[in-house]
């Protein structure tokens, strides 16, 4: 039950995270005009990964796409790449994890296959989350660098008679969405990896051996221990007796075409 919950929760958290990464990537407010210590202007500038926008006080908003590929800063291209890789990996991870979910039954899929798929999707989510966090962090670092450079220009470029309004940019909403979404995807991935540990069957399946105790006839099956992977100690070892009532979580028999996870 705990495994199913962990896997299900990991899936949901990752789903929310990936949706957030997609939202952040599409958002226009990666950087927004810094209004502090600047004259009040009739326009508000903000920029995304794909276009820059200007909202006038009147409410009129105009956005222009970055129609050049070669003319864009390498850092921006890198951020775009990281976010897209994050989305692609996350989407594939979601697809894989749907089939790996313990609560979904597909034909005669073995537990080991589901465990492997859970682990694969978990790793994909982790990498996806890291890509998003890296992308957002690179962009944030770029903003900080540019902010201080333009601040320096504000105070050194006053020699002439004409002043200019130095448009400085600060963190936009998309950065925070990206960080949170990346974090959620990462957490979801870790949860999937943890769930995988409780899904995989024993590496060694022993043949059933009958032990005859005096007065009672019981069959002891060492292979009946709760499934465990090689990641850690088996904390739920339970002896299974023939003829006893067995719950799904308590028994792990040998896979057959009638077995569903």
């Amino acid at each position: 039950m705990a495994v199913t919950a962990c896997q299900g929760l990991g899936f949901v958290v990752s789903l929310i995270g990936i949706a957030g990464i997609i939202a952040a990537t599409c958002m226009d407010q990666w950087s927004t005009q810094d209004l502090y210590n600047n004259p009040v202007t009739a326009v508000f500038n903000y920029q995304g990964l794909w276009r820059s926008c200007v909202r006038e006080s009147s409410g009129f908003t105009e956005c222009r796409g970055y129609f050049t590929l070669l003319g864009l800063p390498a850092m921006l291209q890198a951020v775009r790449a990281l976010m897209i890789v994050g989305i692609v990996l996350g989407a594939i991870g979601l697809l894989v994890s749907i089939f790996a979910l313990k609560c979904i039954r597909i034909g005669s899929m073995e537990d080991s296959a589901k465990a492997n798929m859970t682990l694969t999707s978990g790793i994909m989510f982790i990498v996806s989350g890291l890509c998003a966090i890296a992308g957002v962090s690179v962009f944030a670092n770029m903003l900080v660098t540019n902010f201080w450079m333009s601040t320096a220009n504000m105070y050194t470029g006053m020699g002439g008679m004409v002043q200019t309004v130095q448009t400085r940019y600060t963190f936009g909403a998309a950065l925070f969405v990206g960080w949170v979404a990346g974090g959620l995807t990462l957490i979801g991935g870790v949860m999937m990896c943890i769930a995988c540990r409780g899904l995989a069957p024993e590496e060694t399946n022993y043949k059933a051996v009958s032990y005859h105790a005096s007065g009672h006839s019981v069959a002891y099956k060492p292979g009946g221990f709760k499934a465990s992977t090689g990641f850690g100690s088996n904390t739920k070892n339970k002896k299974i007796y023939d003829g006893g009532a067995r719950t799904e979580d308590e028994v792990q028999s040998y896979p057959s075409k009638h077995d569903y996870v």
């Epitope: 005009q33 009739a42 200007v54 006038e56 409410g59």
Partner: antibody
């Protein structure tokens, strides 16, 4: 067709208050900003302030302390209130609409105000 | 506040001639975000409210004759009337519509010779 029409008292005594109404027709006040501009006789134009579609305002810092702009969307009316009037407040008062940036594409005909005892 | 300086203060013209008037701002009206300069041109005839001719420094308002052309960027702007007509005789104002408080130039008066 967008139309703006100002109406005011015409004559006000010094140190008194002023209230001018701008009635807008042909368009909802929730879709654009309305500015107030004045022009003393034989002189240039002076921007007083603006109320935006959402209700936020900007004022001329020189007049901010005695100026207030409000509106009633249901009546399609914008109000300019000014207190402690002096003789140099004598001017033609215009209301105007802005669509792009802060350029004024539609103006009212203006209402003349004389501050005199 | 932004100071808008217009020159000349008055111009005497004959119908059909080309007229140029300039406007200088004490601070740049250029917005890097959309590569636009927020300056407008108006003309005002006696007893009438001003009429918008040009916004964003060079965009003609609807219904404005093509003989009116706005140019310039940043701090220096020009309004050109390619062939002056009798109905163009008016006072021309430039207007900073970028930085609050919004300000107008003192005007250039166009008179008939």
């Amino acid at each position: 067709q967008v139309q703006l029409k100002e109406s005011g008292p015409g004559l006000v005594a010094p140190s008194q208050s002023l209230s001018i109404t701008c009635t807008v027709s042909g368009l909802s006040l929730t879709s654009f900003g309305v500015h107030w501009i004045r022009q003393p006789p034989g002189k240039g134009l002076e921007w007083l302030g603006v109320i935006w579609a959402g209700g936020s305002t900007n004022y001329n810092s020189a007049l901010m302390s005695r100026l207030s702009i409000s509106k009633d969307n249901s009546k399609s009316q914008v109000y300019l209130k000014m207190h402690s009037l002096q003789t140099d407040d004598t001017a033609m008062y215009y209301c105007a609409r802005s669509l792009y940036g802060n350029s004024f594409d539609y103006w009212g005909q203006g209402t003349a105000l004389t501050v005199s005892s | 506040d932004i100071v808008m300086t217009q020159s000349p203060s008055s111009l005497t013209v004959t119908p059909g001639e080309k007229v140029t008037m300039s406007c200088r701002s004490s601070m740049s009206l250029f917005n890097s975000g959309n590569q636009k300069s927020y300056l407008s041109w108006y003309h005002q005839k006696p007893g009438q409210p001003p009429k918008l001719l040009i916004y964003w420094a060079s965009t003609r308002d609807s219904g404005v004759p093509v003989r009116f052309t706005g140019s310039g960027s940043g701090t220096d702007f020009t309004l050109t009337i390619s062939s002056v007509q009798a109905e163009d005789l008016a006072v021309y104002y430039c207007h900073n519509d970028y930085i609050y408080p919004l300000t107008f130039g003192a005007g250039t008066k166009l008179e008939l010779k």
